[in-house]
């Protein structure tokens, strides 16, 4: 396992005449981002074939607005590396596609527009753990400068990230037959478990006893280069060392077809068969369409039927970005209540609730009243993970077992006297007041200000509050 790292140094007009127009304008500010696609081997695969080694998308670069009249400079770039993790062995030879995308930020209807500015492709040999390799690629009038490397993730080491390193068991040296792990000299190579004789440079294994070959090598022990084991070339003199025919010069030598195009000879010259998304004599003109599948994570691509028209990705819920490349962290809005733990599973949002809570967002208190009785006719109320009793009149305490003094709160108004009663309390009102709590003044003409006294009771009589 390891990581392929790509560092973009500059993207701008290439040398020579015909400098490109700036991709951004005062009316349409824009910013760049990059996409890299990696495939194992020196394959002639079409551009739309899957990025079997992996793919990565950069962050957006700073917003850029063209200065009127100024030539297009190198454009401002996103920060950081593009990193493509690989799980298995590093193949040693690989194909890459690097796309430069423009996001227009003008006030257009329907949101920003995205378009492919340039796409470069190439095939390279690269050993893991080596230094940064520098490269320059041109696409039309644009020039892209970049560096790349492959590095192993511990405990893997070696040119293919297939050797394993382990901390030393003894302080000074490795066990019998085991070498120190350069550059980690304080660690030792783990015991080899591949088939005996399996080439350490060109073979690797994931199961004990097997020997699997890196691209370009074959044979039971991965010691035979593919180029010398299949003598199929139709031209040229014989090679004494290999017994194979060595090709002489031809119009397709050096592959004049750019961006992964394949070359075939014609009676007069050559012809390029371009991968989807490219056209021109040498496949040098690029344009991306919905057929190229630019939308990630199940995004729906609309528009972009031909390379000259833009497309838009309609992203499924939970994804954003011009190519639906960014997963949204819905847990950042803290949807789980009562201290629940939020889990964004992509297809759904889940809350892991603390004890005492339930529901899809931990919004329900569990029934704290189960098996808990409130005495003397009290009713149980759940809340906050603990039960509480709402007691009947005349009772109090946690379980309504304590007899309450109903007169303690001085419920009788206007100087009325309070008497405790088996069913509550009774107020004996002072002259001139009436009501259950002596709250109503009696008018001089004998009429009360609010409800009349019940039949059989005269103003001033003690009234029982039920």
């Amino acid at each position: 396992a390891g990581v392929f790292e790509l560092q973009i140094h500059s993207f701008g007009p290439g040398p020579g005449p015909g400098a490109p127009r700036s991709p951004c304008s005062a009316r349409l500010p824009c910013r760049l981002f990059f996409r890299v696609c990696l495939k194992p081997g020196l394959s002639e695969e079409a551009a739309e074939s899957p990025c079997a080694l992996g793919a990565a998308l950069s962050a957006r670069g700073p917003v850029y607005t063209e200065q009127p009249g100024a030539p297009a400079p190198d454009l401002p770039l996103p920060d950081g590396l593009l990193q493509v993790p690989f799980r298995d062995a590093w193949p040693g030879t690989f194909s890459f596609i690097i796309e430069t995308w423009r996001e227009e930020l003008g006030d257009q209807i329907g949101g920003p527009a995205w378009s492919l500015l340039a796409r470069v492709a190439g095939r390279r040999r690269l050993a893991a753990g080596g230094p940064w390799a520098r490269d320059i690629q041109r696409a039309g009038a644009w020039e892209l400068r970049f560096s790349y490397r492959a590095r192993c993730e511990p405990p893997a080491v070696g040119t293919a990230c297939t050797r394993l390193c382990r901390p030393r068991s003894a302080p000074s040296r490795c066990g019998p037959g085991l070498r120190p792990c350069a550059p980690l000299e304080d660690e030792c190579e783990a015991p080899l478990v591949c088939r005996a004789g399996c080439s350490p440079e060109h073979g690797f294994c994931e199961q004990p006893g097997e020997c699997r070959c890196l691209e370009g090598w074959t044979g039971p022990l991965c010691t035979v280069p593919v180029s010398t084991s299949s003598c199929l070339s139709p031209r040229g003199p014989s090679s004494a060392t290999t017994g194979c025919l060595v090709p002489g010069p031809g119009p397709c030598d050096g592959n004049p077809c750019a961006n992964g195009g394949s070359c075939s000879e014609t009676p007069r010259s050559f012809e390029c068969t371009c991968p989807r998304g490219f056209y021109g004599l040498r496949c040098e003109v690029s344009g991306v369409t919905c057929a190229d599948g630019p939308c990630f994570n199940g995004g729906l691509c609309v528009g972009g039927a031909d390379p000259d028209s833009a497309y838009i990705c309609h992203c499924p819920p939970g994804f954003q970005g011009s190519n639906c490349e960014k997963r949204v962290d819905r847990c950042s809005l803290q949807p789980c209540r009562n201290g629940g733990l939020c889990l964004d599973l992509g297809h759904a949002l889940r809350c892991r609730c603390r004890a005492g809570f339930a529901g899809p967002r931990c919004e329900h208190d569990l029934d704290d009243c189960a098996g808990r009785a409130c005495a003397n006719g009290g009713t149980c109320v759940e809340g906050g993970g603990a039960h509480r009793c709402s007691c009947a009149l005349g009772f109090g305490g946690r379980d309504c077992r304590e007899r309450a003094d109903p007169c303690a709160a001085r419920p009788c108004a206007h100087g009325g006297r309070c008497y405790a009663h088996f069913s509550g309390l009774v107020c004996a009102c002072a002259p001139g007041y009436m009501g259950a709590r002596c709250e109503f003044p009696v008018h001089p003409d004998g009429a009360s200000a609010l409800p009349a006294a019940p039949p059989g009771l005269r103003p001033g009589d003690p009234q029982r509050y039920l």
Epitope: P317, R330, L333, Q334, P335, P360, E363
Partner: nanobody
Framework: QVQLQESGGGLVQAGGSLTLSCAAS????????MGWYRQGDLVAGFTSEG??KYADSVKGRFTISRDDAKNMVTLQMNSLKPEDTAVYYC??????????????WGQGTLVTVKP
């Protein structure tokens, strides 16, 4: 079904202000959480406990408010910077009844801040 309708996006000079609004409609029992995202990250919102939460990059410049009667949140954006340029998406976690909750997204509204 629930819909989120956004409004208020547009083109503004750096240092200027805009107000984004998002109204939820449809089968709504209660709104659990609601806020605004851009480029996949939370900008500002109300959590399920009712507190306002802001991204560090907008604190002191953006203010979120709510109108529970209208099932609506409003994002007041002041002192806008070019780096605030983005499509702003309204998002809401909504109960359609007592036991069913789903996450909903608006279509997005573009905010462009010119230098």
């Amino acid at each position: 079904q629930v819909q989120l309708q956004e409004s208020g996006g547009g083109l503004v000079q750096a240092g200027g202000s805009l107000t984004l609004s998002c109204a939820a409609s449809g089968s709504i029992f209660s709104i659990n959480a609601m806020g605004w995202y851009r480029q996949g990250d939370l900008v500002a919102g109300f959590t399920s406990e009712g507190s306002a939460k802001y991204a560090d990059s907008v604190k002191g410049r953006f203010t979120i408010s709510r109108d529970d009667a209208k099932n609506m949140v409003t994002l007041q954006m002041n002192s806008l910077k070019p780096e605030d340029t983005a499509v702003y998406y309204c998002a809401a976690d909504i109960f359609s009844d007592r036991d069913h909750v789903d996450w909903y997204w608006g279509q997005g509204t573009l905010v462009t801040v010119k230098p």
